[in-house]
Interface confidence: low
């Protein structure tokens, strides 16, 4: 019986030990599991955060790429804009130069005309005077031949401008190179640049012009597409307002709805009509965001200057024997701080 | 003894069971550990990959941001270039129009001079002829008083400028250089530039002009959008590039370097020309917000000013007997790549 009890006690102990080992193992397993789960949670959290960051970065990248693409388009756009500007302005400039040529040619024509008419007038007057003298002298005395001879030199002296020329001039106006741009008729063109420079001195006792001869200044406040007019170039006060871009005299309509006729003595009215005229700056350097002016590379300079690459043949020189007018296109160093 | 053996067998079994449980637990623990380690490796790998991707994205983003910044600078540069272009061209155009005015004024002066000389010649000749006649007529006949009376009108011919010239001038319309480009007829060109220049001197008793005397200058095809060079104007090569904006002849500076030279007594006219003229800046510096103008290096000034930096001694008249217009400062062909 004692032995039995002893063995049973032994067995009991072993069973308890077994249970203890079992529960210890379970606890160990749970601990390991918990440890791993915590670690896994940290790792998964890291992954989630990383993925979120990746998505954010990818979005940022996509947005920036899209904006970058747009900005590249903008740069191309600017290149196009610059080309347009060059085109507009160079066209204006060539037109101005053409006009200068016209003015020059007309001036020559007029001087020729004046000289010619002067000579003609002298000749015709001398002729009539000679006849007159001949008659007078015949009535006075015998030795006509001598007197006639004395009268002859008249016809040989040129008279410049005399009475006759005065009249003839009034009947034949010098050529006016009135050049009016009418964009309505324009074909194959890009833009209307209406640059108007009016320089009229006050005219007194001016007789009425014949119909259709008014001086027309189209679209006074504008410069057509591409150029508002680098106008106001030292014109007299009377018509400085001609190129104003302000709302001057909007009611002053011209005969053709879009034409403004400046009759005598309206110049002052126009000048006075500019509301804030005294505050206006000189046309030609508008649209300047000066805050954007930074240092500029040579390439940029070239880009900015684009369009200078053109030779404009001006002034077909008709006669090398008169009046040399040197257009000394001297560079001015303008000390304005940008 | 039997009982003992029985108990010992029982104990043995329990021990074996204990060992089995122990090794089973150990195996289980190892398995769990391995499983977690594998899982952890995957997660860590994910994290590493994510981190690598994040770094890549961040790098890409940084690079793109840098490029974007550069591109934005380019855009600003383009804006600045464009503005420079606007200013440069505006200035050139102003100069052209100024020169046109000069040509006009000189033309007037020359016509006046021609007229004056003609009249003076007539007057002096008439005077000498009258004396001559008087002497001759006295030698011929008695009724001198009558003859002298007959000769009187001659002596009234003006010396210098007198009645006759007054009339001739008053009846002679000053040249109108209204340059009108009729773009309706214009073919193969990109834009209409309505540049009208009117420059009329004081005219008294002006008679009506004849109708239909305008001279029409047709717009020729000129540099299109994209601007192939506005030089396609068919002028003669003698005087290419009137208003060149190249940096040639930089030494040809005007008196004050930053002043536009205004020939003969035009200063007063210019000064007077505009109510608030005293507030206006020199031509070619329009629309400048001077408050925003920060200091800029000489290089930048040059870049900004492009070809505007020049004094144009407009029409330095060397000799009133010739009329070749030399437009100096030819344009250099600039191959600018934008």
């Amino acid at each position: 019986e004692l032995k039995k009890n002893e063995f049973q006690g032994e067995l009991e102990k072993q069973r308890e030990q077994l249970d203890k080992i079992q529960s210890s193992h379970n606890f160990q397993l749970e601990s390991v599991n918990k440890l791993y789960q915590d670690e896994k949670a940290v790792l998964v959290n890291n992954i989630t955060t990383g993925e979120r960051l990746i998505r954010v970065l990818q979005d940022q990248l996509k947005t920036l790429q899209r904006n970058y693409g747009r900005l590249q388009q903008d740069v191309l756009q600017f290149q196009k804009n610059q080309t347009n500007l060059e085109r507009k302005f160079s066209y204006d400039l060539s037109q101005c130069i053409n006009q200068m040529k016209e003015v020059k040619e007309q001036c020559e024509e007029r001087i020729e005309e004046v000289t010619k008419k002067g000579n003609e007038a002298v000749a015709s007057r001398d002729l009539s005077e000679n006849n007159d003298q001949r008659q007078q002298l015949q009535a006075l005395s015998e030795p006509q031949p001598r007197l006639q001879a004395a009268g002859l030199p008249h016809t040989e002296v040129p008279q410049g401008k005399g009475n006759v020329l005065g009249n003839s001039k009034s009947q034949t106006p010098a050529p006016s190179s009135e050049v009016v741009l009418d964009s309505k008729r324009q074909v194959e063109k890009e833009e209307t640049n209406e640059i108007q420079v009016v320089n009229e001195e006050p005219q007194r006792d001016r007789l009425p012009q014949e119909p259709g001869r008014e001086q027309v200044v189209e679209d006074r406040p504008v410069g057509g597409r591409g150029f508002g007019g680098a106008g106001e170039l030292g014109q007299t006060p009377q018509v400085q307002a001609a190129l104003s871009v302000s709302q001057e005299n909007p009611e002053m309509e011209g005969p053709e709805r879009d034409q403004l006729v400046i009759p005598d003595g309206q110049e002052e009215e126009q000048e006075a009509a500019g509301e804030g005229r005294n505050q206006q700056k000189l046309r030609g350097e508008d649209d300047y965001n000066m805050d954007e002016n930074e240092a500029e590379s040579e390439t940029d300079k070239q880009a900015a200057l684009a369009g200078n690459d053109r030779n404009i043949d001006v002034f077909n020189v008709e006669d090398q024997k008169r009046d040399t007018i040197n257009l000394l296109d001297q560079r001015e160093k303008r000390n304005h701080t940008l | 003894e039997l009982k003992k053996n029985e108990f010992q067998g029982e104990l043995e079994k329990q021990r074996e069971q204990l060992d089995k449980i122990q090794s089973s637990h150990n195996f289980q623990l190892e398995s769990v550990n391995k499983l977690y380690q594998d899982e952890k490796a995957v997660l860590v790998n994910n994290i590493t990959t994510g981190e690598r991707l994040i770094r890549v994205l961040q790098d890409q983003l940084k690079t793109l941001q840098r490029n974007y910044g550069r591109l934005q600078q380019d855009v600003l540069q383009f804006q600045k270039n464009q503005t420079n272009l606007e200013r440069k061209f505006s200035y050139d155009l102003s100069q052209c129009i100024n020169q046109m005015k000069e040509v006009k004024e000189q033309c007037e002066e020359r016509i006046e001079e021609v007229t004056k000389k003609g009249n003076e010649a007539v007057a002096s000749r008439d005077l000498s002829e009258n004396n001559d006649q008087r002497q001759q007529l006295q030698a011929l006949s008695e009724p001198q008083p009558r003859l002298q009376a007959a000769g009187l009108p001659h002596t009234e011919v003006p010396q210098g400028k007198g009645n006759v010239l007054g009339n001739s001038k008053s009846q002679t319309p000053a040249p109108s250089s209204e340059v009108v480009l009729d773009s309706k007829r214009q073919v193969e060109k990109e834009e209409t530039n309505e540049i009208q220049v009117v420059n009329e001197e004081p005219q008294r008793d002006r008679l009506p002009q004849e109708p239909g005397r305008e001279q029409v200058v047709e717009d020729r095809p000129v540099g299109g959008r994209g601007f192939g060079g506005a030089g396609e104007l068919g002028q003669t090569p003698q005087v290419q590039a009137a208003l060149s904006v190249s940096q040639e002849n930089p030494e040809m500076e005007g008196p004050e370097r930053d002043q536009l030279v205004i020939p003969d007594g035009q200063e007063e006219e210019q000064e007077a020309a505009g109510e608030g003229r005293n507030q206006q800046k020199l031509r070619g510096e329009d629309d400048y917000n001077m408050d925003e103008n920060e200091a800029e290096s000489e290089t930048d000034k040059q870049a900004a000013l492009a070809g505007n930096d020049r004094n144009i001694d407009v029409f330095n008249v060397e000799d009133q007997k010739r009329d070749t217009i030399n437009l100096l400062d030819q344009r250099e062909k600039r191959n600018h790549t934008l």
């Epitope: 756009q77 804009n81 964009s183 597409r225 508002g228 350097e285 649209d287 | 804006q79």
Partner: antibody, heavy 122, light 111 residues
């Protein structure tokens, strides 16, 4: 957000005058060329006027030249259209538009206001 | 001036199908710089016009890629590949090679 709000429309008799305004917000007004475009009752679109960012370069079609004057006040972020000698054919919805990119006047209208209606009738 | 010509109405279209709208200019809009200065605007009912296409073939920002445009210097076509209800309105072509001009507009309606 770019916003253009026109005002000043109304009923005017032929020969009368009117001034339209356009208040701009959401962008740097002074950096952009601005235009007016109108839409006739027949739904035809017609460009009316354009002004460069600083106000120097101004363009009009022949139909309004000499009668309409475009101007701007960059300090007030406002665009104006002064109309005079109005005709019945000027009856339209007038839209204030921003031109894509500053400086050039060849580019498309990227933003439009809601429009203001002008009726010219006796 | 350059005249832009459009048909007043497009053939009524079924949702999901494609439609083409034509436009013709009186002068070539292709410039020597390679850019064709043609634009398409859409005016939805009760709204202001909005830009769809610039320089003939470029899609404006925010415009779905169902829209495409092609053409020569004078003949242009706007194509909508899968018409949606929101596409109804008046489609205007415009040029700015010269002073701006618009076509008369083509009205698109759904069957």
């Amino acid at each position: 957000d770019v916003k253009l709000v026109e005002s000043g429309g109304g009923l005017v008799k032929p020969g009368g005058s009117l001034k339209l305004s356009c208040a701009a917000s959401g962008f740097t007004f002074s950096s952009y060329t601005m235009s007016w475009v109108r839409q006739t009752p027949e739904k035809r679109l017609e460009w009316v006027a354009t002004i460069s960012r600083g106000g120097t370069y101004i363009y009009y079609p022949d139909s309004v030249k000499g009668r309409f004057t475009i101007s701007r006040d960059n300090a007030k972020n406002t665009l104006y259209l002064q109309m005079s000698s109005l005709k019945s054919e000027d009856t339209a919805i007038y839209y204030c538009t921003r031109e894509y990119f500053s400086g050039d006047t060849y580019d498309y209208f990227d933003y439009w206001g809601q429009g203001t209606t002008l009726t010219v009738s006796s | 001036e350059i005249v832009m010509t459009q048909a007043a109405f497009a053939n009524p279209v079924t949702l999901g199908t494609s439609v083409s709208i034509s436009c013709r200019s009186s002068k070539s809009l292709l410039h020597s710089n390679g850019i064709t200065y043609l634009y398409w605007y859409l005016q939805k009912p009760g709204q202001s016009p909005q830009l769809l296409i610039y320089q003939m073939s470029n899609l404006a920002s925010g415009v779905p890629d169902r829209f495409s445009s092609s053409g020569s210097g004078t003949d242009f076509t706007l194509r909508i590949s899968r018409v949606e209800a929101e596409d109804v309105g008046i489609y205007y072509c415009a040029q700015n090679l010269e002073l701006y001009t618009f076509g008369g507009g083509t009205k698109l309606e759904i069957k």
